[in-house]
C-alpha cells in the first residue's frame, strides 16, 4: 500500500489483511458514496483470520495468523491504524494468539473472543482498554469457538456460531459486562462457522458461513425482543470466512471463500426491500479479512 496521507473523507469501509495463496498485508478502503477504493498503508505483518474494529476514530486489527510459505504463525497482535496519518502502530498484545477471532466494542473497550492457537480452540475472552493499552481476561464463553461471529447490541456482546474443534455450531451466547457472565441464547436455524455477524436496526444478522458440508448463502436475523431467528433474503454468493460491516443502514459483505474460489464480490443488503445487490469488487479475491467502518 502507499505511504502517503489518506484523503480526509467521511465514512469508509476498511478491509485489512485476508488470505489468497498466503496471508495478506493489504489495507484498502471502500467509499460507498462514490464507489472508489483507496490503497492504504500495509499491515506490518501479513495476517488472515483477523478481526477489525474502530474505537475513537482509530482502526484496530486484532489477532489472526500469518500463513506464508515460510511458516504459519498465529497472532496475538493488536495493531492500530490512524486514518489521519495513514500509519500503523503496535499496541499491547493479547494474552494468547487468536486466529479466526471475533471482536466487539462496548464503551470504547475491545473484546477479543475465542479463536485458535494451534489446535487449541479458545473459549477465553479478553478486554482491551485503549487509554491504558492493557488487556484483561473476562469470563470465558460457555463454548469454545473459532470462526465466531461477534456483535454488540444494547451494550451486550453476542458470540454466534463457530467451530469448537469437533463440531460446527448453531449455538449463540450473550455476555453481560455488568455481571461478567455468559448466557446461552436461542440457537440459529442453521449451523454456521465463519459467518458474518453484525447488528442492524436492533437485530443481529448472521450471513453465510460453513455448516460442515457446504458454504452458505442463507442469512438469518435474531430479534432480541422475541428471541427468535428468522431467515431473510439469501446472498447471491455462498461464502464463508467473509468480512461484514454496516454502513448507513445497510449490510456489506466482503469476499470470503465459496468452496472453490476466493471471492472479490461485495454485496449490500437493503433491509427495506429485503434484497442483496452486488455493489463493487475488491481489488482481488480473498477470505478471512478484518472489516470495520470509520466513525463520522
Amino acid at each position: 500500500g502507499s505511504m502517503g496521507h489518506a484523503p480526509k473523507v467521511g465514512r469508509l469501509i476498511y478491509t485489512a489483511g485476508g488470505y489468497f495463496r498466503q496471508s495478506l498485508s493489504y489495507l484498502e478502503a471502500y467509499n460507498p458514496s462514490d464507489g472508489t477504493w483507496l490503497d492504504l498503508a500495509d499491515l506490518q505483518v501479513p495476517r488472515s483470520g483477523l478481526a477489525g474494529c474502530v474505537v475513537g476514530g482509530l482502526l484496530y486489527a486484532v489477532g489472526g495468523r500469518n500463513n506464508s510459505p515460510d511458516g504459519n504463525t498465529d497472532s496475538s497482535a493488536l495493531d492500530c491504524y490512524n486514518p489521519m496519518t495513514n500509519q500503523w502502530s503496535p499496541c499491547a498484545p493479547m494474552s494468547v494468539p487468536r486466529n479466526r477471532i471475533g471482536v466487539g466494542v462496548i464503551d470504547g473497550h475491545i473484546y477479543a473472543v475465542g479463536g485458535s492457537h494451534g489446535c487449541i480452540h479458545h473459549n477465553s475472552v479478553e478486554r482491551y482498554e485503549p487509554e491504558r493499552d492493557e488487556w484483561h481476561l473476562v469470563a470465558p464463553m460457555l463454548t469454545r469457538r473459532i470462526g465466531v461471529g461477534v456483535a454488540v447490541l444494547n451494550r451486550l456482546l453476542y458470540a454466534v456460531g463457530g467451530f469448537d474443534g469437533t463440531n460446527r455450531l448453531n449455538s449463540a451466547e450473550c455476555y453481560y459486562p455488568e455481571r461478567n457472565e455468559w448466557r446461552m441464547i436461542t440457537a440459529m436455524n442453521t449451523i454456521r462457522s465463519g459467518a458474518g455477524v453484525c447488528v442492524l436496526h436492533n437485530c443481529i444478522y448472521a450471513a453465510g458461513g460453513y455448516d460442515g458440508q457446504d458454504q452458505l448463502n442463507s442469512v438469518e436475523r435474531y430479534d432480541v425482543e422475541t428471541e427468535t431467528w428468522t431467515f431473510v433474503a439469501p446472498m447471491k454468493h455462498r461464502r464463508s470466512a467473509l468480512g461484514i460491516t454496516v454502513h448507513q443502514g445497510r449490510i456489506y459483505v466482503l469476499g470470503g471463500y465459496d468452496g472453490h474460489t476466493f471471492l472479490d464480490s461485495v454485496e449490500c443488503y437493503d433491509p427495506d426491500t429485503d434484497t442483496w445487490s452486488e455493489v463493487t469488487r475488491m481489488t482481488s479475491g480473498r477470505s478471512g479479512v478484518g472489516v470495520a467502518v470509520t466513525m463520522e
Epitope: S48, C119, Q213, S287
Partner: antibody, heavy 120, light 107 residues
C-alpha cells in the same frame, strides 16, 4: 462407501511438473480438510499439504512450499496437488487423505496412493 | 518444527503379547497425536486420534495414552493381522510431523 482415488503419478524429469488428482466418492470433499501425505521408497510418512474447507487456506511442508499447490474443486469432488520444479527427493508414493473432522491433519481415510518418480 | 521420536524402531513379538510403542514430542503438543498402522504396499490406516480416542471400526485391543509429551500406543493382545509398521503423528502445529515408525515383526 468412502473412497479416495489418486491418479496422475508417473515418471518425470528433475525440474518437471505433474498434477496429481484425488477423486472422492461417498462423501463431499467440501466436508473435510484434505491432506496429501507422501512416503519415499522404504521410508516413513511425511505430511505434504492441507486445505481447509471453510476458509480455503492451505498449508505446506517447508520442503515443498513454493513448488507445490493444493487445491479443491467441489463441483468435481476432486482435490489436486500441482507439483512444479520437481526434485529427485520428491520421489514417493503420494496419498490423498481426508481428516475425521475431529482432529486436524489426521488422515482418517487415505487412498491407495500414486507413485511419483523423479529421475533423469 | 516439532520432532516426534518414536521407539523402538522395530520389535519382535508373538501372537497374544502385549505390545507398547512410544512417541516423545520435542515440545508440548497437547493431545494432538494420532497413531497409524501401515502394511507393505498399502495406505496408512488411522487407529487413534487425539492421543486416546479410538477411531471407528478399530478393534478395542488398540489404545492410546498420553503423559505430558510422551505418547503410547498399546496393543493389548497382538493378533496375526497386527504385524505391520506403526507411526505416530502430531497435528498440534504445522508442519504436522510423523515419527519414524515402528516395525512389529513376528518372533
Amino acid at each position: 462407501e468412502v473412497q479416495l482415488v489418486e491418479s496422475g503419478g508417473g515418471l518425470v524429469q528433475p525440474g518437471g511438473s505433474l498434477r496429481l488428482s484425488c477423486a472422492a466418492s461417498g462423501f463431499a470433499i467440501s466436508a473435510s480438510s484434505i491432506h496429501w501425505v507422501r512416503q519415499a521408497p522404504g521410508k516413513g510418512l511425511e505430511w505434504v499439504a492441507s486445505i481447509d474447507p471453510e476458509t480455503g487456506e492451505t498449508l505446506y511442508a517447508k520442503s515443498v512450499a513454493g513448488r507445490f499447490t493444493i487445491s479443491a474443486d467441489t463441483s468435481k469432488n476432486t482435490a489436486y496437488l500441482q507439483m512444479n520444479s520437481l526434485r529427485a527427493e520428491d520421489t514417493a508414493v503420494y496419498y490423498c487423505a481426508r481428516d475425521n473432522g475431529r482432529a486436524r491433519a489426521t488422515a482418517a481415510y487415505a487412498g491407495q496412493g500414486t507413485l511419483v518418480t523423479v529421475s533423469s | 518444527d516439532i520432532q516426534m521420536t518414536q521407539s523402538p524402531s522395530s520389535l519382535s513379538a508373538s501372537v497374544g503379547d502385549r505390545v507398547t510403542i512410544t512417541c516423545r514430542a520435542s515440545q508440548s503438543v497437547s493431545s494432538a497425536v494420532a497413531w497409524y498402522q501401515q502394511k507393505p504396499g498399502k495406505a496408512p490406516k488411522l487407529l487413534i486420534y487425539s492421543a486416546s480416542s479410538l477411531y471407528s471400526g478399530v478393534p478395542s485391543r488398540f489404545s492410546g495414552s498420553r503423559s505430558g509429551t510422551d505418547f503410547t500406543l498399546t496393543i493389548s493382545s497382538l493378533q496375526p493381522e497386527d504385524f505391520a509398521t506403526y507411526y505416530c503423528q502430531q497435528s498440534y502445529s504445522f508442519p504436522s510431523t510423523f515419527g519414524q515408525g515402528t516395525k512389529v515383526e513376528i518372533k
